[in-house]
Amino acid sequence: CRTSECCFQDPPYPDADSGSASGPRDLRCYRISSDRYECSWQYEGPTAGVSHFLRCCLSSGRCCYFAAGSATRLQFSDQAGVSVLYTVTLWVESWARNQTEKSPEVTLQLYNSVKYEPPLGDIKVSKLAGQLRMEWETPDNQVGAEVQFRHRTPSSPWKLGDCGPQDDDTESCLCPLEMNVAQEFQLRRRQLGSQGSSWSKWSSPVCVPPENPPQPQVRFSVEQLGQDGRRRLTLKEQPTQLELPEGCQGLAPGTEVTYRLQLHMLSCPCKAKATRTLHLGKMPYLSGAAYNVAVISSNQFGPGLNQTWHIPADTHTEPVALNISVGTNGTTMYWPARAQSMTYCIEWQPVGQDGGLATCSLTAPQDPDPAGMATYSWSRESGAMGQEKCYYITIFASAHPEKLTLWSTVLSTYHFGGNASAAGTPHHVSVKNHSLDSVSVDWAPSLLSTCPGVLKEYVVRCRDEDSKQVSEHPVQPTETQVTLSGLRAGVAYTVQVRADTAWLRGVWSQPQRFSIEVQVSD
């Protein structure tokens, strides 16, 4: 037999299919020009010493073969003895290691069998009613196709599906969408209505993320507040990456999960903007304010579940940094200014109340005064910090108040509101004899003592009603008792106590009269 012809003799090997798992498969035959044809196939298994034979049976029942040697592609003309206008059955027999392996048969009319391409170029992926929709442009001059898909997950083998007939310049396919795992899809096409026509090769992989992006499993830590009033937010654990099917490993466009950081500054609610979304590429600096931080995962189908953390406010206080002067017109605060043209946010809330009850005021951008101080004033009528109770005050600063990540904490401290000097007056002053010339004076703690750092000291005043001599005794703010000694028996005294703050002298308590009785010896 001539090599260019189909040989109508018995092939040069025994006719017995070994039934092994390896062997020839995916036989495709089609016309490649007006008078030439091509068949190609895949061979699975070791290729050393393998000889391939393309077998052909005509409708008359006569059969022939082409010897392809080690090649897996073979061309022949319409003069090779194979009927091209009538239906023929073709298959491949591979002779290897003294056994024959056979491919599945294809039955087709060669003249009408056109080589179909898989979807080429960009395959657009979208979600439609809980399913996956793939769309692509039909390859040139190939309108009218049957389309199949196959898909797999990282843990499952290929599953075959049908896209149905296509008859347009664009083709599409509805496929199953997995909720929580990535999938790899491939598509193939063949001529529509041409009985037995060959399938195209499989397309390049289309990698599809799960419908729900994975929930980010990350942990944050926040550093100590620095001298500049800012603290670095750091990511302790990077988000886990999605497990991908085999063909999607490496660069898999389409399956990417994007993680973003949503920052919500809870403190200073009167500022212009409370939230900002950032890329995880760089962790921001935060002020000492309270924040909620969420990591949002999203993929091409949209956002998934997020994970939220609360970062509590830094409560480190600096009792000396804030000067407060109370005048007839109102109250003014002074603190060391940060820089030129700074906006300050002054926030206050009654101690022991829910953080949601904070009130704040935003200053206009201000430069330091000649003493290098920044100020904030309010009138009594405004009602700000007007109640006689302890307030926690925090001052934040920013040169760009609309930028959430550029606020810094200037100071945090406590302040007793309203008429602190009167409200702080100690009550329940009592005097007890201590010895022949001394007494013990006790009093109930001043309301100011509920406000950390506000009460500077108590002062106890003792007045000799005879000589009108007055002595004053400073007492530590943590003490509510003092011993007065060097007193004379039979003399009337009055004692008073007041509570002082760093900026305000307290009001004396009601005078308490006492005397040490003269001891008469028997």
Epitope: R276, T277, G281, K282, Y285, K403, T405
Partner: nanobody, 124 residues
Framework: EVQLVESGGGLVQAGGSLRLSCAAS?????????IGWFRQAPGKEREGVSL????????YYADSVKGRFTITSDNAKNTVYLQMNSLKPEDTAVYYC????????????????WGQGTQVTVSS
């Protein structure tokens, strides 16, 4: 007054390269700024392509340009560059430079300062 001036756009064949520059005046890159490149194709929303932090050089790239585009900054010249390799027709857009005072890399487009934009056209 802050000004951002882009240059380096043009027409290029698919697979080719371009280098965009963004020269900033009125701000100093030694401060905390996010500087980056956004693009807008006809009929599409503006999207962030690549960002860099002026303070520590941290970067962000959109998935569509990873491995092809590289962002760098020269703080001495107050200039940011975007090296674009293996360009594709879908990279065709007006590319804008933007800067924002911030200590992170914001993913929104609420940036304070914007350039006029430079056209990049990739032909197939």
């Amino acid at each position: 007054e802050v000004q951002l001036v882009e240059s380096g756009g043009g027409l290029v064949q698919a697979g080719g390269s371009l280098r965009l520059s963004c020269a900033a005046s009125g701000i100093t890159f030694d401060d905390d700024y996010a500087i980056g490149w956004f693009r807008q194709a006809p009929g599409k929303e503006r999207e962030g392509v690549s960002l860099i932090s002026s303070s520590d050089g941290s970067t962000y790239y959109a998935d569509s340009v990873k491995g092809r585009f590289t962002i760098t900054s020269d703080n001495a010249k107050n200039t940011v560059y975007l090296q674009m390799n293996s360009l594709k027709p879908e990279d065709t857009a007006v590319y804008y430079c933007a800067a924002d005072p911030t200590s992170g890399l914001p993913s929104d487009d609420e940036y304070d300062y914007w350039g006029q934009g430079t056209q990049v056209t990739v032909s197939s």
